[in-house]
């Protein structure tokens, strides 16, 4: 039953909380089989999604997945938004579902997350690279 | 070959808190796209989906009863464990757990045989 | 919530013949991502349910190609081509393009 579709793992209501000023690499966990497709990042300006061209991405192969970064180096708040990553792969388009960064300005404490906040969101208290796509394999 | 089984109490008492565990085979919880979800018929009536735990142990709930539920995972085991809280005489259903695959979002493709659970004093 | 409605909800069939259930949806399953989360499900006497369609029209494993589904936006169908004893039961759609997910309230179908 193993299928050789394309599949992007993000999950609908996706979302990291990070802090402006430090790095974060948002990832796009890619399936496929034999030719690696391109993809690509967007974000979301309302209805349309404005691809993203000039920022720094990479691969990262694992075993039975890969993982398309967006590096944030660092983030800065006006990346706050959705993001959605799309592959092509012969001739078919695949879009992922929309990411969501909440960025906190390190400047502005009162919009810092709440002690509640941090113990519903527990990786808010990672750094970015232990930030809250646990990849298990 | 994929196969889900739950098992729990087939009687609860009214306020009690109702354990169930789906012990599953076949695949395994830590591959991306692989999701459990919980969901439940009363006697007659139709599905009422519950919760769900993703591959990276995300988790999501119906709004109308997320205030009485957890759900939890245990990769090493095969199980996950749906909790719910002040059980009532109209939580009598029968309980099934069901596997999420994944073609771009979650879709149903095994169930487990489903337990009944009755509520009452 | 995304209310799923079903018709009809009883459905006498006779063997050999075709036979179609219509589901509906209160908002449009076209989700952002271009894909339309419909699915449907079999549950025949007794036992618990089986998937039969995801994805609007495709086939699950196993399932044999008598079963077809169709639709958009919020109008959906499910046809048995020719039906056989083995497909009698109750048929479920679902959606998981709106948390929460939901289903239809079933369609029995019996034969004639």
């Known amino acids: 039953k193993e299928s050789c579709d394309v599949q992007l793992y993000i999950k609908r209501q996706s979302e990291h909380s990070i802090l402006a000023g430090d790095p974060f690499e948002l990832e796009c966990p890619v399936k496929y089989c034999a030719n690696r497709p391109h993809v690509t990042w967007c974000k979301l300006n309302g209805t349309t999604c404005v691809k993203l061209e000039d920022r720094q991405t990479s691969w990262k192969e694992e075993k039975n997945i890969s993982f398309f970064i967006l590096h944030f180096e660092p983030v800065l708040p006006n990346d706050n938004g959705s993001y959605r990553c799309s592959a092509n792969f012969q001739s078919n388009l695949i879009e992922s579902h929309s990411t969501t960064l909440y960025v906190t300005d390190v400047k502005s404490a009162s919009e810092r997350p709440s002690k509640d906040e941090m113990a519903s969101r527990p990786w808010l208290l990672y750094r970015h690279h232990h930030h809250h796509h646990h990849h298990h394999h | 070959q994929v196969t889900l089984k739950e098992s729990g109490p087939t009687l609860v008492k009214p306020t009690q808190t109702l354990t169930l565990t789906c012990t599953f085979s076949?695949?395994?919880?830590?591959?991306?796209?692989?999701?459990v979800s919980w969901i439940r018929q009363p006697p007659g009536k139709a599905l009422e989906w519950l919760a769900h735990?993703?591959?990276?142990?995300?988790?999501r709930f119906n709004p109308s009863l997320k205030s009485r539920l957890t759900i939890t995972k245990d990769t090493s085991k095969n199980q996950v464990v749906l909790t719910m809280t002040n059980m009532d005489p109209v939580d009598t259903a029968t309980y099934y757990c069901?596997?999420?695959?994944?073609?771009?979002?979650?879709?149903?493709?095994?169930w487990g045989q489903g337990t009944l659970v009755t509520v009452s004093s | 919530d995304v209310v799923m409605t079903q018709s009809p909800l009883s459905l006498p069939v006779t063997l050999g013949q075709p036979a179609s259930i219509s589901c509906k949806s209160t908002q449009s399953l076209l989700d952002s991502d271009g894909k339309t989360y419909l699915n449907w499900l079999q549950q025949r006497p007794g036992q618990s349910p089986r998937s039969l369609i995801y994805?609007?029209?495709k086939l699950d494993s196993g399932v044999p190609d008598r079963f077809s589904g169709s639709g958009s936006g919020t109008d959906f169908t499910l046809k048995i081509s020719r039906v056989e004893a083995e497909d009698v039961g109750v048929y479920y759609c679902w959606q998981g393009t709106h948390f929460p997910w939901t289903f239809g309230q079933g369609t029995k179908v019996e034969i004639k």
């Open positions: 069901a596997r999420g695959n994944w073609d771009g979002e979650t879709y149903f493709d095994y």
């Open positions: 076949g695949f395994s919880l830590s591959t991306f796209g692989m999701g």
């Open positions: 994805l609007v029209s």
């Open positions: 735990i993703y591959w990276d142990d995300d988790k």
